[in-house]
């Protein structure tokens, strides 16, 4: 049924509604650090260059269907995608010597989530099953936050949007049977 | 046309069993989610029970799980619903529903033809 | 489970327009669809899926539904639309449907 043309599991499902997973810990408490939507960065920055774009946290909207297995949100939800470059990066010369590279140097700022937010949504699922409630975590605010190494391993890894997230503490689903009968009133057997 | 016939209503004293029978025609009944629903009187809809169209799946108000046991024979064109354990607040017109998937994936699966309803009296 | 509530009753003018609203929990996320039931009579579905008509409904029935308020719109309501109407959504957390509370329409 063109289900994977929907696949995307960077939205995390909380496995029941009454639990919903606390954001992870300021990594950097900087109250002067400009609001991410406006492009801002910290302020006297080691390595600030005049070029402010290398520094921009944008938030980017994106609409996009939930997915839990073979299930799928009745609608579309729309949630943020942190992008962009807060660097700090040096400019520094290549080893061939013909021209520059960007290589991280110094603390190492991310555009990652900083808030997030819980959203109801109703599941449709193929192979006669009922839809169901259920809620969601999204992306509500984007940040630049100064990561250490360790924390480069851990929590770039779990705001990744790209790959798909482990569902914690949930079976996964049974596949949906296949249909048997004349596919057109099929559709309707659900 | 499509008709939901439905039967087995009557007076059963507290604790006692009862079975709803809610015979289809004019669509092909096996392809179809089918559900029940009840109303009490002078009351609003209170959803019952779920069957899918191969009775692979089943779901129920948590009012009813447990003593209610919903089924289907289609080869007979018939849904049921078992009531064991009843209480004087199962007492309702019980409705069956044929249930309808509009668009992709069902979209929100709609109630769209009902039964006239059959009436379940739990009285001593 | 999210709760759908709607108001115990609504009053219109004959050719007036009529809303009923239904509200829950982020219930725009949901689709939501509408019964009509006349006294003595089986639930007839007036609107599916938000703002679709089944065949035979009448073209002055519409809905809407976003954020937390599902709205169902009767424009030019007639003398025989007076009934007992109710929302509808697969709401529950494991497979439930949840209807809203009784809504009585009376057209003055």
């Known amino acids: 049924q063109g289900w994977q043309a929907f696949k995307n599991d960077a939205t995390e499902i909380i496995p029941e509604l009454g639990e919903y997973p606390e954001p992870p810990p300021e990594l950097e408490n900087n109250k002067t650090m400009n609001r991410a939507e406006n492009g801002g960065r910290p302020p006297h920055h080691p390595f600030e260059t005049k070029d402010v774009s290398e520094y921009s946290c944008r938030e980017l909207h994106f609409t996009r269907y939930v997915t839990d297995g073979p299930c799928r949100s009745a609608k579309p939800v729309t949630e943020l995608v942190c992008s962009g470059q807060c660097g700090p990066a040096r400019l520094l010369p290549n080893a061939i010597g013909r021209g520059k590279w960007w290589r991280p140097s110094g603390p190492d700022f991310r555009c990652i989530p900083d808030r997030y937010r819980a959203q109801r949504v109703q599941l449709l699922c193929p192979g006669g099953e009922a839809p169901r409630a259920r809620k969601v975590r999204l992306v509500a605010s984007c940040k630049c936050k100064r990561l250490t190494r360790f924390h480069n391993q851990s929590e770039l890894k779990d705001f990744g949007t790209e790959a798909a997230r482990p569902q914690k503490g949930r079976k996964p689903r049974p596949r949906a049977r296949s249909a048997k009968a004349n596919q057109a009133e099929l559709e309707n057997a659900y | 046309q499509v008709q939901l016939v439905e039967s087995g209503g009557g007076l059963v004293q507290p604790g006692g069993s009862l079975r709803l029978s809610c015979a289809a025609s004019?669509?092909?009944?096996?392809?179809?989610?089918m559900n029940w629903v009840r109303q009490a009187p002078g009351k609003g809809l209170e959803w019952v029970s779920f069957?899918?169209?191969?009775?692979?799946?089943?779901y129920y108000a948590d009012s009813v799980k447990g003593r209610f046991t919903i089924s289907r024979d289609n080869s007979k064109n018939t849904l049921y619903l078992q009531m064991n354990s009843l209480r004087a607040e199962d007492t309702a017109v019980y409705y069956c529903?044929?249930?309808?998937?509009?668009?992709?994936?069902?979209?929100?699966?709609?109630?769209?033809?009902w039964g006239q309803g059959t009436l379940v009296t739990v009285s001593s | 489970d999210i709760e759908l509530t709607q108001p115990p009753s609504v009053s219109v003018a004959p050719g007036q327009t009529a809303r009923i609203s239904c509200s829950g929990d982020?219930?725009?996320?949901?689709?939501v669809h509408w019964y009509q039931q006349k006294p003595g009579q089986a639930p007839v579905l007036v609107i599916y899926?938000?703002?679709n008509r089944p065949s035979g409904i009448p073209e002055r029935f519409s809905g809407s539904n976003s954020g937390n308020t599902a709205t169902l719109t009767i424009s030019g309501t007639q003398a025989e639309d007076e009934a007992d109407y109710y929302c509808?959504?697969?709401?529950?957390?494991?497979?439930?449907?949840v209807f809203g509370g009784r809504t009585k329409l009376t057209v003055l």
């Open positions: 529903a044929r249930t309808f998937m509009h668009g992709h994936l069902g979209g929100g699966l709609s109630m769209d033809f």
């Open positions: 004019g669509f092909t009944f096996s392809s179809y989610v």
């Open positions: 069957i899918s169209g191969d009775s692979s799946n089943t």
């Open positions: 982020n219930i725009g996320s949901f689709y």
């Open positions: 899926d938000d703002n």
């Open positions: 509808g959504s697969w709401a529950g957390s494991s497979g439930s449907y």
